[in-house]
């Protein structure tokens, strides 16, 4: 997280820290007491594109709450993970839910609307480009999708598109994604924050929902927008996968 | 009831028989285990128009179920009883509800629609113009209101109205009333049936509702329509009165 | 008049212990029921538990007891709707 | 971890008899509850009564017990929503 605030109170008990092969920090989001969402890209970090979920599983280390190590039983990649940058992690044991460790809900309603603010917590790189040692969070507005597409791809018209990412890496942008950021204080997500939730507070229900999962965490206040996978598009697959496994 | 059928099974456990001063039989309808609805006209039978509820109370005898005598504590007349022909009777003790003695529900929904069939039970006069000694009932369709008004008042236009009741007595007809009858078999309500419910079966809820209370029971298959007070217009007053008393 | 059987006698301590569930516990209660042709009218759900003062209380109604109110419009033998 | 107090010990027969109500009776039950941060997932309402075979049964779920599932999206210390 570039800028933002320290999570002193444990306000993001769904936030997990995942250490990938070769020690890179990434994010994951607890969505039940035995399952987490993260990005497919996170899972493939330092693996070849042909790696299987079985190959990936033993290379990951996962922490929830206050540095509580949890063991991973399996990884399930989204069947269309090159388009929907998502994977699921199943733990060997259910975690005990406490005030420090609690899943976030997956939404049935579509909370995404330009200007709406969400909270993104993360263990990713800070303004010094170091991985943070204390959980941070930032408050980011949902962006206008067309502006985001133009920012990264020059145009919304397919034949006029070309790759214009200010950070040299292109996000996956499609109907399953939305964009958020930047704040006027130049606060943003950064490397290692991917897999974290775009958390929205439904005030009617007094419940926090993961409206999205951060996929493109390379903006780092250089590019204007982080890109998130829409959680509403995941719910059916998530529920089926959890039920099957 | 003129024509109709005998209630052999006890299908109208809300039906009460009220004997007024000088032994006239009338109807009343159990709407809770301590309260009944009847018409104001029934209560005033053989009393002067200036009689008070306190004067009327001791002159009434009331039976529920299979001739079970119940004692009356008080009578409450509708505040506008010359327009809304209704009164409430409170019993000294709650009756024990059994398969023979059970209140009918008052509706929140408006069940009245032309052509809809309701059931009216009663202890009133039969085709021989004698009071029946066994409870009878008849199935009657809700009538078109304008036809009913024309039948009794010659016109629906106020300035063209004149009193044309085929039975020489005029019903109270207004926005608080509806009409029902006659069947093709010349079945009808008659003297003494007033105070009985126009009972409609809500098949969705499998519950019987008093959609109306028979006010004008003088049709006797000579005039075409009985006239009923709409129960939806009574509910608030009934609930307030029961709560206050 | 059928008044229902109490599932557990207050003088009977031979009651089998209910099974435990993960992350849960059991609470012992009484539920008020109504005889035939009556239904429960309660501020809460008609279920009462013993508080520390050994009084039966409902979470919503407190010590206030429910009432059994007469059912309406449910004749045991509805009319045969024929002509 | 707070697991709740059992309101009535199974070995304790000093339980005060609940008050009677007109036209009603009482039924004795156990209700499954969940510890903090969990909620009951049950086919029925989580309330079980003893049947004639002295088994704890729920009207909907039968002998199948409920589960305590993790609550989601209810942090004890939500973020201060200010900037």
């Amino acid at each position: 997280i570039i800028g933002g605030s320290m999570d002193a109170k444990g306000s993001f008990p769904w936030q997990a820290k995942m250490i990938s092969r070769h020690g890179l920090t990434t994010g994951a989001t607890l969505i039940s007491d035995q399952w987490l969402l993260t990005t497919a890209k996170n899972l493939f970090l330092n693996h070849s594109e042909t790696a299987s979920a079985k190959d990936i599983t033993p290379t990951l280390t996962l922490y929830v709450g206050k540095n509580q190590l949890v063991e991973i039983e399996k990884v399930v990649l989204h069947p269309n993970h090159s388009v929907v940058d998502i994977g699921l992690i199943k733990l060997k044991q259910r975690v005990l839910v406490t005030e420090r460790v609690m899943p976030i809900c997956l939404p049935s309603k579509d909370y995404i609307a330009p200007g709406r603010v969400g909270y993104v917590s993360g263990w990713g790189r800070n303004a010094n480009f170091r991985f943070t040692d204390r959980l941070k969070y930032v408050m980011l507005p949902v962006a206008d999708q067309d502006k985001c597409v133009v920012h990264y791809e020059n145009s919304t018209v397919p034949e006029k598109k070309n790759l214009t990412s200010p950070v040299g890496v292109q996000p996956i942008l499609n109907e399953h994604t939305f964009c958020a950021g930047l704040t006027k204080y130049q606060e943003d997500t950064c490397y290692g924050d991917a897999g974290s939730a775009f958390a929205i507070h439904d005030m009617e229900e007094d419940t926090w929902y993961a409206a999205g999962i951060l996929s493109f965490d390379k903006s780092c206040a250089v590019a204007e927008y982080g890109v998130y996978v829409r959680a509403t598009d995941l719910k059916d697959w998530v529920q089926e996968t959890m039920a099957k496994n | 009831i003129i024509g109709g059928s005998m209630d052999a099974k006890g299908s109208f456990p809300w039906q009460a028989k009220m004997i007024s001063r000088h032994g006239l039989t009338t109807g009343a309808t159990l709407i809770s285990d301590q309260w009944l609805l009847t018409t104001a006209k029934n209560l005033f039978l053989n009393h002067s128009e200036t009689a008070s509820a306190k004067d009327i109370t001791p002159t009434l005898t009331l039976y529920v179920g299979k001739n079970q005598l119940v004692e009356i504590e008080k009578v409450v007349l509708h505040p506008n009883h010359s327009v809304v022909d209704i009164g409430l009777i409170k019993l000294k003790q709650r009756v024990l509800v059994t398969e023979r003695v059970m209140p009918i529900c008052l509706p929140s929904k408006d069940y009245i629609a032309p052509g809809r069939v309701g059931y009216v039970s009663g202890w009133g006069r039969n085709a021989n113009f004698r009071f029946t000694d066994r409870l009878k009932y008849v199935m009657l369709p809700v009538a078109d209101q304008d036809k009913c008004v024309v039948h009794y008042e010659n016109s629906t236009v106020p300035e063209k109205k004149n009193l044309t009741s085929p039975v020489g007595v005029q019903p109270i007809l207004n926005e608080h009333t509806f009409c029902a009858g006659l069947t093709k078999y010349q079945e009808d309500t008659c003297y003494g049936d007033a105070g009985s419910a126009f009972a409609i079966h809500d098949m969705e809820e499998d519950t019987w509702y008093a959609a109306g209370i028979l006010s004008f029971d003088k049709s006797c298959a000579v005039a075409e329509y009985g006239v009923y007070v709409r129960a939806t217009d009574l509910k608030d007053w009934v609930q307030e009165t029961m709560a206050k008393n | 008049v059928e008044l229902g059987n109490d599932a557990m006698d207050f003088e009977d301590d031979s009651c089998p212990k209910p099974p435990e569930i993960a992350n849960g516990y059991v609470e012992h209660l009484v539920r008020y029921r109504c005889r035939q042709f009556y239904r429960l009218r309660a501020e809460g759900d008609g279920v009462y538990t013993l508080n520390d003062e050994k009084q039966w209380v409902n979470t919503v109604a407190g010590e206030k007891l429910p009432e059994c109110e007469a059912v309406c419009g449910k004749p045991k033998h509805p009319v045969d709707q024929v002509q | 971890v707070e697991l709740g107090n059992d309101a009535m010990d199974f070995e304790d027969d000093s339980c005060p008899k609940p008050p009677e109500i007109a036209n009603g009776y009482v039924e004795h039950l156990v209700r499954y509850r969940c510890r903090q941060f969990y909620r009951l997932r049950a086919e029925g309402d989580g309330v079980y009564t003893l049947n004639d075979e002295k088994q704890w049964v729920n009207t909907v779920a039968g002998e199948k017990l409920p589960e305590c599932e993790a609550v989601c999206g209810k942090p004890k210390h939500p973020v201060d929503q200010v900037q």
Epitope: - | K109, A113, H201, M203, E204 | Q83 | -
Partner: antibody, heavy 121, light 107 residues
Framework: EVQLLESGGGLVQPGGSLKLSCVAS????????MSWVRQAPGKGLEWVST????????FYADSVRGRFTISRDNSNNMLFLQIDSLRAEDTAVYYC??????????????WGQGALVTVSS | DIQMTQSPSSLSASVGDRVAITCRAS??????LAWYQQKPGKVPKLLIY???ILQSGVPSRFSGSGSGTDFTLTISSLQPEDVATYYC?????????FGGGTKVEIK
């Protein structure tokens, strides 16, 4: 005049899904039970599903249970039928129908014009 | 579930004839039965409900009778405009099954 207007019909492949809508006007929609009835080409009427007025009770014919889902939106006077796992035998005109009286399940006094659903590969 | 069986499945009669269509329920449904008329290419039209009550606007040559399990729709004097398929439907509680239909034609 009471009106019922269906939409959402069309050609679908076996195994596919479709959502039919019925918009109602000129009556107090929430007070009436509403149903879907279908008619296969050249065949008779078949009751499909009913949604109660009060609460949220839903009923289905055995032939569609588990595949069809009826729902209603009283605030917008709309009735829906979500049709999943479509089969060739689901090909029919689907009618939206209103119970005649408050508290009644059936005896439909108003019908929509029908929406044709064709299941074919 | 209660089955509704209509007979005959089709009939042909002359103008002015008295025509009767029967509908049998596999279990008693009291008088909770409706009759519909459907002309080719048109939506069904309610004729009779509660077994014998004529829907407003329906000609009086149509009548219904019966209760329990056996019901009859009668057209006292068949008219050319009565050419249609007629259906019964149980209306007591779901499932709200229809009969198979009776096609009425003019000789």
């Amino acid at each position: 005049e009471v009106q019922l207007l269906e939409s959402g019909g069309g050609l679908v492949q076996p195994g596919g899904s479709l959502k039919l809508s019925c918009v109602a006007s000129e009556f107090t929609f929430s007070n009436y039970a509403m149903s879907w009835v279908r008619q296969a080409p050249g065949k008779g009427l078949e009751w499909v599903s009913t949604f109660s007025s009060g609460g949220s009770r839903t009923f289905y014919a055995d032939s569609v249970r588990g595949r069809f889902t009826i729902s209603r939106d009283n605030s917008n006077n709309m009735l829906f039928l979500q049709i999943d796992s479509l089969r060739a035998e689901d090909t029919a005109v689907y009618y939206c129908a209103k119970a005649q009286f408050v508290g009644h399940w059936a005896q439909y006094n108003y019908w929509g014009q029908g929406a044709l659903v064709t299941v074919s590969s | 579930d209660i089955q509704m069986t209509q007979s005959p499945s089709s009939l042909s009669a002359s103008v002015g004839d008295r025509v009767a269509i029967t509908c049998r329920a596999s279990q008693g449904i009291r008088n909770y039965l409706a009759w519909y008329q459907q002309k080719p290419g048109k939506v069904p039209k309610l004729l009779i409900y509660d077994a014998f009550i004529l829907q407003s606007g329906v000609p009086s040559r149509f009548s219904g009778s019966g209760s329990g399990t056996d019901f009859t729709l009668t057209i006292s004097s068949l008219q050319p405009e009565d050419v249609a398929t007629y259906y019964c439907q149980k209306s007591d509680s779901p499932p709200l099954t229809f009969g198979g239909g009776t096609k009425v034609e003019i000789k």
